[in-house]
């Protein structure tokens, strides 16, 4: 059937529309388009003869129409008057006529709307505001947006006048928002610019800060007042009812007891005409003396001396408080307080006891803190550390060794090579070393205050060629699914490549295997019994490559759930019962048996001769691995028939 489709159906003024013909019959002579729902010669727009391909304009032709050979009609530069029905009249070769009607609607492109308001400065809880979306346009839909969201549901919001007017009853400060209106018709949608509603409110009851009401003589009093208000409030201060100043802040330096009293802040909003006040009572106390700490030993020696710290001055009926590292005193058998808490004794001081220490005197109002005191604990030297940690160096390089030992006062250092004193410095430097520089390098650290000294010896080999490596491990007996193991390839040498093999193969890719420290360290996370393999490390440099002897990882595991054999559970009276228990475990587990919950023997095999129905019951095998600290068990029911 012949049909007409309008593309688009809703057309904007100035745009174009295509009346698209569907199911056009075969063997046509020609066709004509008419304005309206019927064929009317006075309202013919255009005719078209197929044989001549000739288009002939009709009385309703405006010059904006184009007819296509497929009978479709394009109308350009659409005007409002073009709205309506269009009829296509098709003349077949057999002169039989066929008609079809289509239609479209024309709408104007909407202008950008604007918002008018009946009240630019409404007062909170008093006024209403009506916003109107301009201009008024026919066939347009009106929408409203608040802070770019659609209108909330509220009994105080009302739409009227075909949604063109939005009324806010009894405005509140929360109605201070961005309002937009939108006009829509089938061909366009436009939003207005934002209108910000300026709601006048307040002042609310003012807040005076800070909140504390107690001060010490000699302090500065600095009070600030704030009240929520639009426009911002004007502030006034009164002390004991007497006006002081019209400022938001009140500042009185170096206060005395005479400044005690009631302090009132008044907030005023000139637009709403409202006033609100808040009163705070300030108390000024006389100043107690500042405490200080005395010590009976200013340079105590670690692990030898005790130190008594005393809080001065001594004042009757006073509470003394102590702090270490800005924290209250930790519980420790090495810390003792005297009965009145005035003296803090540190027994057998350590380097971690340096502090700082503070004491405090508590009065009605606050706690007065002393200045911090730091203890100068003499300690060390600890065993010195020689860095870097390399033990092998190639000939021709510079040897630069540094020694460090924790010590207070800082240690004095000496270097010896093969027992011969070299120099009294923290660093030892030898340029362009040869094999002759191989030997025992000793760093000696001395603490002049404590008189103690400690040494560390390091064997250094100068050789282009590396030795056969060895593997060190941080855990010789790791527990399955619990421990990690770090293997390290020794020695540590410069310009050296480190390689690893497991059971003669290169390392498998596994998230549980990790190489670090320049591939010198191989870490196995969360070991399993399958990791009990032979590990070999290799070292390589320009003139040598060598492999370590294998190290086999001894993984402790189990005990797994035990198995009782034989599996039989039914026996004849008079038979021998011979139960064997086995559990996978490293090391081998300890076995024990219980019959009907009663402990029996600590053996792997349970033997009972000539059983009777009295031997019916539950037989439990318990296994425990002392190395892993894990236990397991299994229960088997035995039935003896007469």
């Amino acid at each position: 059937k012949l049909t007409i489709e309008s593309t688009p159906f809703n057309v904007a003024e100035g745009k174009e529309v295509l009346l698209l013909v569907h199911n056009l019959p075969q063997h046509l002579f020609g066709y004509s388009w008419y304005k309206g729902e019927r064929v009317d010669g006075n309202r013919q727009i255009i005719g078209y003869v197929i044989g001549t391909q000739q288009a002939t304009p009709g009385p309703a032709y405006s010059g904006r129409e184009i007819i296509y050979p497929n009978a479709s009609l394009l109308i350009q530069n659409i005007i409002q008057n073009d709205t309506g029905f269009y009829t296509l009249h098709v003349i077949k070769s057999d002169l039989v006529n066929e008609e079809a009607t289509g239609q479209f609607r024309v709408y104007p492109e909407l202008p950008k709307p604007s918002i008018s308001s009946n009240n630019s400065k409404p007062v909170e809880d008093k006024d209403a505001v009506a916003f109107t979306c301009e201009p008024e346009t026919q066939d347009a839909t009106y929408l409203w947006w608040v802070n770019n969201q659609s209108l909330p549901v509220s009994p105080r919001l009302q739409l009227s006048n075909g949604n063109r007017t939005l009324t806010l009853f009894n405005v509140t400060r929360n109605d201070t928002a961005s309002y937009k209106c939108e006009t829509q018709n089938p061909v366009s949608a436009r939003r207005s610019d934002s209108v910000i509603l300026n709601v006048l409110y307040g002042p609310d009851a003012p807040t005076i800060s800070p909140l504390n009401t107690s001060y010490r003589s000699g302090e500065n009093l600095n009070l600030s007042c704030h009240a929520a208000s639009n426009p911002p409030a004007q502030y006034s201060w009164f002390v004991n009812g007497t006006f002081q100043q019209s400022t938001q802040e009140l500042f009185i330096p170096n206060i005395t007891v005479n400044n005690s009293g009631s302090y009132t802040c008044q907030a005023h909003n000139s637009d709403t005409g409202l006033n609100r006040t808040t009163v705070t009572t300030i108390t000024v106390y006389a100043e107690p003396p500042k405490p200080f700490i005395t010590s009976n030993n200013s340079n105590p020696v670690e692990d030898e001396d005790a130190v008594a710290l005393t809080c001065e001055p001594e004042i009757q009926n006073t509470t003394y408080l102590w702090w270490v590292n800005n924290q209250s005193l930790p519980v420790s058998p090495r810390l003792q307080l005297s009965n009145d808490n005035r003296t803090l004794t540190l027994l057998s001081v350590t380097r971690n006891d340096v502090g700082p220490y503070e004491c405090g005197i508590q009065n009605e109002l606050s706690v007065d803190h002393s200045d911090p005191v730091i203890l100068n604990v003499l300690y060390g030297p600890d065993d010195p550390t020689i860095s870097p940690s390399y033990t092998y160096y190639r000939p021709g390089v510079n040897l630069s060794l540094s020694c460090h030992a924790a010590s207070n006062p800082p240690a004095q250092y000496s270097w010896l090579i093969d027992g011969n004193i070299q120099q009294h410095t923290q660093e030892l430097f030898i340029s362009n070393i040869t094999e002759k520089n191989s030997g025992l390098y000793t760093c000696q650290a001395n603490n002049s205050a404590s008189g103690h000294s400690r040494t560390t010896v390091k064997t250094i080999t100068v050789s282009a060629e590396l030795p056969k490596p060895s593997i060190s491990s941080n855990n010789s007996k790791p527990v399955e699914d619990k421990d990690a193991v770090a293997f390290t390839c020794e020695p540590e040498a410069q310009n050296t490549t480190y390689l690893w093999w497991v059971n003669g193969q290169s390392l498998p890719v596994s998230p549980r295997l990790q190489l670090s420290n320049g591939n010198r360290t191989l870490t196995l996370f969360n070991v399993t019994r399958n990791d009990a393999r032979a590990y070999v490390c290799g070292i390589q440099n320009s003139v040598s490559a060598n492999r370590s002897d294998p190290v086999t990882l001894d993984v402790l595991y189990g005990p797994d759930t035990p198995i009782i054999s034989p599996p039989d559970s039914s026996y004849l009276s008079g038979a021998n019962l011979n139960l064997s228990c086995h559990s996978a475990s490293n090391p081998s587990p300890q076995y024990s048996w219980r019959i009907n919950g009663i402990p029996q023997q600590h053996t792997q095999v349970l033997f009972i001769a000539k059983i009777t129905p009295n031997n019916n019951g539950t037989y439990a095998c318990f296994v425990s691995n002392l190395a892993t600290g894990r236990n397991n068990s299994i229960v088997k029911s035995i039935t003896v028939s007469a």
């Epitope: 190639r394 000939p395 021709g396 040869t434 094999e435 002759k436 191989s438 080999t461 100068v462 050789s463 282009a464 060629e465 030795p467 056969k468 490549t497 390689l499 290799g538 390589q540 320009s542 003139v543 040598s544 490559a545 060598n546 492999r547």
Partner: antibody, heavy 120, light 106 residues
């Protein structure tokens, strides 16, 4: 199967230069170091030096500093030895040798040698 | 440089006879390595790191020593052992070889 294949014999004039090659198969030369050794007619072995093909680092015996230059082409798995300002003293068989990191020792793989004759 | 001196320069041995070649270093070394070379062929490693037998080398070969004095021993001479033997140090640069010991079959 690890192999080192060296280029053929060279007859060169005094004062000129020559470039010898050593192509490895069965391993990647970047995984180790390539050493060069020479042996004069009826004489002992002399170490010339080594190159690290991965980064181009080199070490030369003082005697061969300025005389020998090592290079590599890792794409063709080949090491080169260039000898300059040749004299009759440089007449010798030149060997490349190498130890793979999977093996437990070095100098375990040798090329067949390239004979260089310096003569006018 | 570290000079390696081999002795004797030439040695003759009958099949089944024990042969010892020594290598003396002018400076102490960590390890000594030994090579065998037959006429017209490339050198072949026989002992590495003083006392380790290289792959495919008969057990009649052994090495020992420390510091500046090292030796290579063939417990029972065989015809195929006739060759020139070189010691090598890799402890210091330049790497050096001994002058060689020629082992002949008597």
């Amino acid at each position: 199967q690890v192999q080192l294949q060296q280029s053929g014999a060279e007859l060169v004039r005094p004062g000129t230069s020559v470039k010898l090659s050593c192509t490895a198969s069965g391993f990647n030369i970047k995984d180790s170091y390539m050493h060069w050794v020479r042996q004069g007619p009826g004489q002992g072995l002399e170490w010339i030096g080594w190159i690290d093909p991965e980064n181009g680092d080199t070490e030369y015996a003082p005697k061969f500093q300025g005389k020998a230059t090592f290079t590599t082409d890792t794409s063709s798995n080949t090491a080169y030895l260039q000898l300059s300002s040749l004299t009759s003293e440089d007449t010798a068989v030149y060997y490349c040798n190498e130890g793979t990191p999977t093996g437990p020792y070095y100098f375990d793989y040798w090329g067949q040698g390239t004979t260089v004759t310096v003569s006018s | 440089q570290n000079v390696l001196t081999q002795s004797p320069a030439i040695v003759s041995a009958s099949p089944g006879e024990k042969v010892t070649i020594t290598c003396s270093a002018s400076s102490s070394v960590s390890y000594m390595h030994w090579f065998q070379q037959k006429p017209g062929t490339s050198p072949k490693l026989v002992i590495y790191s003083t006392s380790n037998l290289a792959s495919g080398v008969p057990a009649r070969f052994s090495g020992s020593g420390s510091g500046t004095s090292y030796s290579l021993t063939i417990s029972r001479m065989e015809a195929e052992d006739a060759a020139t033997y070189y010691c090598q140090q890799r402890s210091s640069y330049p790497l050096t070889f001994g002058g060689g010991t020629k082992l002949e079959l008597k």
